[in-house]
């Protein structure tokens, strides 16, 4: 559904967003997971969402950082393939991926929602709805 | 249908400020952002930032990033850009843009902003 | 930032000849890739996105390909409404729109 192809790239959006920041962010590492395995997308998703990415207190971009941090873990309305993904018992808990620095962290975030953008519109049998 | 109406010409003085709207009719205002999108005279399309229409979140070009402010009256349907500080290389043709799936499906019929002393 | 490079930036071609214009990423931009058509004193219109994917009510004589840094825009016969400028723009990164390339008749 062209709603949730637009939060995705929304989502991109936002991260690329912060990544400009990345030096203003916490520099803890965060599970950030990786090659996930067919029907755990939304599963992955949710646990990037989950993760305590946050602003170092430091500078003027604080406001601009945390707003954005807000906004990427907004939940949007749910298809039916995320509810039944986030209660499968198979889907790698969030604490068993590869924790990582703020930088991969984003970079694999986006190309999770790359990823699954992709496998939207190759399920698309037909040409654009709305673009 | 959807559409995207944008405000009239404006001519404005070296470091002043301009504000052009932009109202959307023909869809749910807050299910789409919107792009704002500029074309200086005979040159190409230059991309200045975008603004959730539902929370004002916005994120704008590096190169425009402290002279522009996009915003948005859910009231009325219109987003706003607003450039300040501006110069003659600010003269231009400044669209909206729908942010659609995955391009800008629809376009506002540009605003010619003139800056001249 | 991710550039992109337009070619070329004018051609001249008469009713019914095969079109090509081709843009060029800075880096890799996987498919993220979207063409629009601008006629003088108007708004652009899309045209293809992601690549390959033909926007509603677009005519079948335009195709789009290409992967990676280099794409391609093909109109497969020229029609006399088809004489414009054409701007090719990623969405890999933010947004950035290549140079544009003006389609004039012969």
């Known amino acids: 559904q062209d709603r949730h192809m637009i939060r995705m790239r929304q989502l991109i959006d936002i991260v690329d967003q912060l990544k400009n920041y990345v030096n203003d962010l916490d520099p803890e590492f965060l599970p950030a997971p990786e090659d996930v395995e067919t029907n755990c997308e939304w599963s992955a998703i949710s646990c990037f969402q989950k993760a305590q990415l946050k602003s170092a207190n430091t500078g003027n971009n604080e406001r601009i950082i945390n707003l954005s941090i807000k906004k990427l873990k907004r939940k949007s309305p749910s298809t039916g393939a995320e509810r039944r993904q986030k209660h499968r018992l198979t889907c790698p808990s969030c604490d068993s991926y590869e924790k990582k620095p703020p930088k991969e962290f984003l970079e694999r975030f986006k190309s999770l929602l790359q990823k699954m953008i992709h496998q939207h519109l190759s399920s698309r049998t037909h040409g654009s709805e709305d673009s | 249908q959807v559409q995207l109406v944008q405000s009239g010409a404006e001519v404005k003085k070296p470091g002043a400020s301009v504000k052009v709207s932009c109202k959307a009719s023909g869809y749910t205002f807050t299910d789409y952002w919107m792009h704002w999108v500029r074309q200086a005279p005979g040159q190409g399309l230059e991309w200045m930032g975008l603004?959730?229409?539902?929370?004002?979140?916005?994120i704008y070009n590096q190169k425009f990033k402290g002279r522009v402010t996009m915003t948005r009256d859910t009231s009325t349907s219109t987003v706003y850009m607003e450039l300040s500080s501006l110069r003659s290389e600010d003269t231009a043709v400044y669209y909206c843009?729908?942010?659609?799936?995955?391009?800008?499906?629809?376009w506002g019929q540009g605003t010619l902003v003139t800056v001249s002393s | 930032d991710i550039q992109m490079t337009q070619s070329p930036s004018s051609l001249s071609a008469s009713v019914g000849d095969r079109v090509t214009i081709t843009c060029r990423a800075s880096q890799d931009i996987s498919n993220y890739l979207n063409w629009y058509q601008q006629k003088p004193g108007k708004a652009p219109k899309l045209l293809i996105y992601?690549?390959?994917r033909l926007h509603s009510g677009v005519p079948s004589r335009f195709s789009g390909s290409g992967s990676g840094t280099d794409f391609t825009l093909t109109i497969s016969s020229l029609q006399p409404e088809d004489f414009a400028t054409y701007y090719c723009q990623q969405f890999h990164t933010l947004r950035t729109f290549g140079g544009g390339t003006k389609v004039e008749i012969k």
């Open positions: 843009a729908r942010y659609g799936p995955l391009a800008m499906d629809y």
């Open positions: 992601y690549t390959s």
């Open positions: 603004i959730d229409t539902s929370e004002s979140y916005t």
